[in-house]
């Protein structure tokens, strides 16, 4: 092993080393120093490095820390951040393209109920698009209100044309006698059922992604503590202070001190596994009617046939709504 | 029975359903992403050799540096931690995870709990429990096709329902990525602050 | 032909009300979902409020939300603005605009009645 | 809410010049983007929804485009009557937000 330079040696490689990360050249002893105030760096004999010099060396060791911290994540968070943008925009996708196919539906099947089918299918896909973002709407509401709103029109448009254009007090009639006499049968529970398992699935594979960038984010962006500081300087930097630049730190030393200045983002790693395996079970059950792109694009079609059962038993139900609704009917023939 | 609106957008770039095999869907997307991930499964526990490896460290040299003095690479005292004085390396060990790191894994807690929910047979509704319900037809099998909508004549078969990637306007593929390849960057001058 | 006329519009003090009027013809507008959309001078548009045909969705902007209210009479073909508790920064020209959920879009606009707040 | 940045603020160009305004959004908007055009002293008039399809009357030299975050408008050859301040609005998200506009002036 080499011992330290001699005293009368001067530090001029260790200058032209520091000039790099400090311009200006104050800080650097002209020749070899005793190093009492050093607080990391201790020296066995004369050393090149100031207290001043030190400081900068644990600076630039956490920085670099950060930057190589930063390097090694940027492939994951790259997959992440991209998969996360695509997914989202594919979905919004689906949304768009099941509504278009909703009004296809309506104005190739039931022209007369348009517009205002377009409204309430619009209104609906837009609070689809809402709560897939994380809004705080329930789906089961969501279809329902789908459901009332179109029973109105398709009641007074399809089954009873004869009636006057639809004023508020038969219209909250007939959105309460859609429940209580289920006139369409067991169709709104179906389509809250598959509507509610996909979105919410698709709801939670968003947020997991997410937070899987929040989670790279957050460990991309330590403060390393001061101790991790001194350990890393020590690492890096000590051996230039007896003119040893060309030096490398040990492997087996950098594993310990890396593990030592990492202890707690290895924490996080039980945790992420857990993360990729569960995210990995959530996407192996994402089919049928736990997927969104199936459940939306078949929509318009089991909306079709939810206004043929109520058409198919119009003649009862115009019966029945003709005496539950006959006040409100009266009123709106005045 | 309901008009299937597959021709009536074409003016309006709506994606008409793919008959094509082999096209790229949303669940072959998702599955992609799952594969690509489990790449990363240790990414944590990796993470301080990653570090080494990928900052100067000794490979081909016969002496290093320990912290404190040159060592031969192979000596014991080449793994020890030179200034053993100065502050106790498993004292850094035991402060714990800072707050954030805390926070973070309590957010990954949670939505793990909600991943194992949402993936539970028993939480699930089956499609099982919509068939008592009489509205999927029995002649729906269980291959690529899926079953839409109702019964009778309003039913239709969708086959690899969208083509997501003619649509996106980004390429997903991470090969293009900035510092895609671990493998691939260079240890020591990739860093700008280290003059080895 | 379709048309909306909108009215109602002043002159008014800060802290005062207005009531606007829109007057749809040429389409059932008992169908439509309607909008107001303010331009203040020399400045782009903002939509100000949201009803659906039935009245059975409202919606408003944060700037003119519980100052604001949008209603309709499906039997009179027409929609109407009270606003209360009027601002300067609420000077502006009110445009009566149909919404058309099968565009998404603005597509039918009144000619717009100025509003003018100030002391 | 989605703020929608609309470049340039002012377009200098002659009649017969192609015109191409640009409307970029803070986060996607899918294709729920509408472009309006609105003359002085007149309401705004619908020209182009869905990001891409032409209103009812609207001349076929206006043409939109794109999706996600960045549109585009392109009138190919203009008409004197052209000249008008242009307005992007996305209804991807409530409330529905507008650009603040690109002014197309006679150089």
């Known amino acids: 092993q080499p011992p330290p330079p001699p005293p009368d040696a001067t530090c001029h490689q260790v200058r032209s080393f520091f000039q790099r990360l400090q311009p200006g050249l104050k800080w650097v002893p002209e020749t070899p120093v005793p190093g009492s105030d050093l607080q990391v760096c201790l020296p066995k004999g004369p050393t090149c490095c100031s207290r001043k010099m030190e400081e900068k060396y644990q600076l630039t060791a956490r920085l670099n820390m950060e930057q190589l911290l930063q390097s090694a994540s940027m492939e994951l968070k790259f997959l992440i951040i991209q998969n996360a943008a695509v997914f989202q925009e594919a979905f919004e996708i689906v949304v768009r393209h099941a509504k278009n196919y909703t009004n296809a539906m309506f104005k190739n099947n039931y022209p007369s109920l348009t517009p205002q089918a377009f409204e309430f299918v619009g209104e609906f896909f837009t609070d689809v698009s809402l709560y897939i973002l994380g809004s705080d709407i329930n789906v089961d509401d969501m279809v329902n209100e789908l459901f009332d709103s179109l029973f109105p029109v398709i009641y007074t448009q399809l089954m009873n044309p004869g009636l006057p254009d639809s004023a508020l007090d038969i219209n909250e009639c007939l959105r309460g006698a859609r429940r209580d006499l289920k006139v369409f049968g067991n169709f709104p529970k179906l389509i809250m059922t598959q509507v509610s398992k996909s979105l919410q699935v698709t709801r939670i594979f968003l947020q997991a992604l997410n937070l899987g960038i929040e989670v790279i984010n957050t460990t991309d962006h330590l403060k390393f503590s001061k101790d991790c500081g001194r350990m890393l300087t020590r690492m890096w930097y000590c051996s230039y202070c007896q003119g040893l630049m060309m030096v490398k730190p040990c492997g087996g030393y950098c594993n310990v001190v890396m593990q030592g200045c990492m202890a707690g983002v290895v924490e996080i790693d039980k945790y992420w596994r857990e993360y990729i395996l569960s995210l990995e079970e959530l996407v192996n059950g994402m089919y049928r009617i736990y997927d969104m792109e199936n459940v939306l694009l078949g929509l318009f079609s089991t909306i079709h046939d939810s206004i043929q059962y109520v058409q198919k038993n119009a003649g009862k139900l115009t019966t029945t709504i003709g005496k539950l609704c006959a006040h409100s009917q009266q009123r709106q023939y005045r | 029975s309901a008009y299937y609106p597959e021709d009536l957008f074409i003016d309006k770039k709506v994606l008409k359903v793919a008959h094509v095999e082999h096209e790229e869907t949303l669940s072959s997307r998702r599955r992609e992403l799952i594969q690509k991930l489990k790449s990363f499964i240790s990414f944590y526990s990796a993470l301080p050799g990653y570090i080494c490896s990928h900052s100067p460290v000794a490979e081909n040299d016969t002496l290093c540096w320990n912290g404190q003095e040159l060592v031969e690479r192979y000596s014991q005292k080449a793994a020890r931690n030179g200034m053993k004085n100065q502050f106790n390396l498993h004292e850094l060990k035991m402060k714990g995870p800072e707050p954030v790191v805390s926070q973070i894994i309590d957010k990954l807690k949670h939505i793990n709990q909600l991943l194992r929910t949402m993936s539970m047979p028993k939480g699930r509704v089956l499609d099982k429990n919509l068939d008592e319900e009489g509205f999927e037809s029995g002649d729906c099998g269980d291959d690529e096709d899926e079953c839409i909508g109702g019964s009778g004549d309003g039913m239709i078969k969708v086959k690899n329902q969208l083509r997501f990637l003619a649509e996106l306007a980004y390429d997903l593929d991470v090969d293009d990525a900035p510092g895609n390849s671990q493998q691939a960057t260079p240890k020591d001058n990739e860093i700008s602050t280290f003059h080895n | 032909e379709v048309q909306l006329v909108e009215s109602g519009g002043g002159l008014v003090q800060p802290g005062g009300s207005l009531r606007l009027s829109c007057a749809a013809s040429g389409f059932t507008f008992s169908s439509y979902s309607m909008n107001w959309v303010r331009q203040a001078p020399g400045k782009g548009l903002e939509w100000v409020s949201y009803?659906?045909?039935?009245?059975?969705?409202?919606k408003y902007a944060d700037s003119v939300k519980g100052r604001f209210t949008i209603s309709r009479d499906n039997a009179k073909n027409s929609l109407f603005l009270q606003m209360n508790s009027l601002r300067d920064e609420d000077t502006a020209v009110y445009y009566c605009?149909?919404?058309?959920?099968?565009?998404?879009?603005?597509?039918?606009w009144g000619q717009g009645t100025m509003v003018t707040v100030s002391s | 809410e989605i703020v929608l940045t609309q470049s340039p603020a002012t377009l200098s160009l002659s009649p017969g010049e192609r015109a191409t305004l640009s409307c970029r959004a803070s986060q996607s908007v899918s294709s729920y983007l509408a472009w309006y055009q609105q003359k002085p002293g007149q309401a705004p008039r619908l020209l182009i929804y869905?990001?891409?399809n032409r209103a009812t009357g609207i001349p076929a030299r206006f043409s939109g485009s794109g999706s996600g975050t960045d549109f585009t408008l392109t009138i190919s050859s203009l008409e004197p009557e052209d000249f008008a301040v242009y307005y992007c609005q996305q209804r991807s998200n409530w409330p529905p937000t507008f650009g603040q506009g690109t002014k197309v002036e006679i150089k």
């Open positions: 869905d990001a891409s």
């Open positions: 605009a149909r919404w058309e959920w099968e565009l998404d879009a603005f597509d039918i």
């Open positions: 009803i659906r045909s039935d009245s059975r969705t409202i």
